[in-house]
């Protein structure tokens, strides 16, 4: 199995740790881990281009999209590789994510692994939305916090 | 500029059919979530249907399922509705919007009256 | 089902007046809140998405804001053209629905 892990930062007080593994090289990858400080409700989850946090998040670059894809939503198939999807975030700021997803991988075309995970400030709207940018980012809003993908032993 | 444009309302006797287009422009048309919203004379909106861009998904409001169906034909940068088993209380003026769950651009409507 | 709770439904006020419309659910909806305003014999229009997003050419006397169940659409400065029906509108539930419409008239 390969195994990955992400520690997420912001300017703020969201933070996290993620954590990824994939038992064989084309199967699904299994993402889980606890980001805290957010606000109650929903938050986009992407991975982002550029494994570059140089000026913060901002420069992490658009999603992760190898594929020239619209933006859309996990399950579907118009989608960037990094749209993961949203995280919920309860009453007390902690959001628990437990996902597995077939269309990331942490070796390949489609590999994660040195690309910077984001949690956005607002709900993705998954592609649904009535403008341009709803099949570009979601329309999820400014980037709270961020990190790296690293392998993990 | 994008245009939305809806043709096909009229007069239609309870238990009639109409069918609804949109023409689009100015937009990539094949990329975007439609829907179709109406609102009944002096009342309120409320969203009607909608369709996801490649046509593979659609969802409906309870008061329509089973009556109405919405498709595309993303060749011709089309939206229609098709409206079945007519009922008085789907007199409404029937726009098409941009967007699946909310909604960008609107079209100028198309008024249809179910009365007999 | 969302309920949605728009108030109040008119408000009369002068040019050059703040304005607030409130908009209640029935539960949570996340960020999922989008604000329209009609004109008579118009279609609706959007000002703002996902609670707080100003619509592209929408001026910036408007602001959105809230979060969970209250939500708040401001005009800073009431302009003539802005006197209008205002409508908030939750996408995060199927089916998706408006509140009820706040008339918006000249005092």
């Known amino acids: 199995a390969t195994k990955a892990v992400c520690v997420l930062k912001g300017d703020g007080p969201v933070q996290g740790i993620i954590n990824f593994e994939q038992k064989e090289s084309n199967g699904p990858v299994k993402v889980w881990g606890s980001i805290k400080g957010l606000t109650e409700g929903l938050h986009g989850f992407h991975v982002h281009e550029f494994g570059d946090n140089t000026a913060g998040c901002t420069s992490a670059g658009p999603h992760f999209n190898p594929l020239s894809r619209k933006h859309g939503g996990p399950k579907d198939e118009e989608r960037h590789v990094g749209d993961l999807r949203n995280v919920t975030a309860d009453k007390d700021g902690v959001a628990d994510v437990s996902i597995e997803d077939s269309v990331i991988s942490l070796s390949g075309d489609h590999c994660i692994i040195g690309r910077t995970l984001v949690v956005h400030e607002k709900a993705d709207d998954l592609g649904k939305g009535g403008n341009e940018e709803s099949t570009k980012t979601g329309n999820a809003g400014s980037r709270l916090a961020c990190g790296v993908i690293g392998i993990a032993q | 500029e994008v245009q939305l444009v809806e043709s096909g309302g009229g007069l239609v006797q309870p238990g009639g059919s109409l069918r609804l287009s949109c023409a689009a422009s100015?937009?990539?048309?094949?990329?975007?979530?439609m829907s179709w919203v109406r609102q009944a004379p002096g009342k309120g909106l409320e969203w009607v249907a909608n369709?996801?861009?490649?046509?593979?998904?659609?969802d409906y409001v309870d008061s329509v399922k089973g009556r109405f169906t919405i498709s595309r034909d993303n060749a011709k940068n089309s939206l229609y509705l098709q409206m079945n088993s007519l009922r008085a209380e789907d007199t409404a003026v029937y726009y098409c919007?941009?967007?699946?769950?909310?909604?960008?651009?609107w079209g100028q409507g198309t008024l249809v009256t179910v009365s007999s | 089902v969302i309920w949605m709770t728009q108030s109040p439904s008119l408000l009369s006020a002068s040019t050059g007046d703040r304005v607030t419309i409130s908009c209640r659910m029935s539960?949570?909806?996340?960020?999922?809140l989008a604000w329209y305003q009609q004109k008579p014999g118009k279609a609706p229009e959007v000002l703002i998405y996902?609670?707080?997003t100003l619509q592209s050419g929408v001026p910036s006397r408007f602001s959105g804001s809230g979060s969970g169940t209250d939500f708040t659409l401001t005009i800073s400065c009431l302009q003539s053209e802005d006197f209008a029906t205002y409508y908030c509108q939750q996408y995060y539930s199927f089916p998706y629905t408006f509140g009820q419409g706040t008339k918006l008239e000249i005092k």
């Open positions: 100015g937009f990539t048309f094949s990329s975007f979530w």
């Open positions: 369709i996801k861009h490649d046509g593979s998904e659609q």
């Open positions: 996902a609670v707080s």
């Open positions: 919007a941009r967007g699946g769950i909310w909604f960008g651009p």
């Open positions: 539960q949570g909806i996340s960020s999922y």
